[in-house]
């Protein structure tokens, strides 16, 4: 599932390159392992912002698929309460390219621990 999430992220990156979206997104670029679920939640919430701002059907479908995949992969620990983690709004705002790169890094963290 996580491998499919990465391919969806690459697809979103390709789709966005053909558009002009200037959004800045809350991005966790240095995820601590004990906060990875919280960070994933922030990434997914911000991904929905991309979908809404793009107004593009392919991006919308890919984001929805990515959320479904991530949800199922995290169904066992998605409700784990992590303490001492940053709120999404406390994270640094970065452009879409940097956001997607950081997103791939966190997904790789999940792949390495699964």
């Amino acid at each position: 599932n996580w491998v499919n999430v990465i391919s969806d992220l690459k697809k979103i990156e390709d789709l966005i390159q053909s558009m002009h979206i200037d959004a800045t997104l809350y991005t966790e670029s240095d995820v601590h392992p004990s906060c990875k679920v919280t960070a994933m939640k922030c990434f997914l919430l911000e991904l929905q912002v991309i979908s809404l701002e793009s107004g593009d059907a392919s991006i919308h479908d890919t984001v929805e698929n990515l959320i479904i995949l991530a949800n199922n992969s995290l169904s066992s620990n998605g409700n784990v309460t992590e303490s001492g983690c940053k709120e999404c709004e406390e994270l640094e705002e970065k452009n879409i390219k940097e956001f997607l790169q950081s997103f791939v890094h966190i997904v790789q963290m999940f792949i390495n621990t699964s």
Partner: antibody
Framework: EVRLMESGGGLVKPGGSLKLSCAAS????????MSWVRQTPEKRLEWVAT????????YYPDSVKGRFTISRDNAKNTLYLQMSSLRSEDTALYYC???????????????WGQGTSVTVSS | DVLMTQTPLSLPVSLGDQASISCRSS???????????LEWYLQKPGQSPKLLIY???NRFSGVPDRFSGSGSGTDFTLKISRVEAEDLGLYYC?????????FGGGTKLEIK
Amino acid sequence: EVRLMESGGGLVKPGGSLKLSCAASEFTFSNYAMSWVRQTPEKRLEWVATISRGGDYTYYPDSVKGRFTISRDNAKNTLYLQMSSLRSEDTALYYCARRVSMITGGWAMDYWGQGTSVTVSS
Amino acid sequence: DVLMTQTPLSLPVSLGDQASISCRSSQSIVDITGNTYLEWYLQKPGQSPKLLIYKVFNRFSGVPDRFSGSGSGTDFTLKISRVEAEDLGLYYCFQDSFVPYTFGGGTKLEIK
């Protein structure tokens, strides 16, 4: 008023195939994900398949995965369910339903058709 | 898979009474983004199911305010404050937080 009209049901032998259709009207079909849901003779409901707005992504429960294929033709405003290797437990009334977007709405099935009956028996 | 357990199986009521239907999931159905995709559907005799409530407590357009949904995590409830004749039928809860999406077994609301 949103309209969904299923067709293609009938009597089929175990191991056989059938293709169901769902004609959509009175809404922009390509703006919505769609699902198939079936109701057994005992009145239990079972989710069968979901397809994304553009048709690139499909989802199934294990009970039908590899046997059923959901697809859509946005130009014809039509949803399909290709069923193969049919079993007696696939006997049910099959409904198509429109899905509200997870991102902009509640991810619910807000409108359903009247259903088409499938009987698998020798 | 998430198992959805509905109780009671049958609920005999008098018109004007309050009715309450319970739905319990085998695991939390709060998704990673914090949403709980729990719906309630009503199937009247001879009709297809109709959406009543989505995301636990949101009433679908045209649904009377005597219907209300509540709950969180694994425990959910549908309440009908004053049952009317048109409310009779089969009620189903449904989770679409996690694939495979699953329905409860149904509750038949009938006249006592």
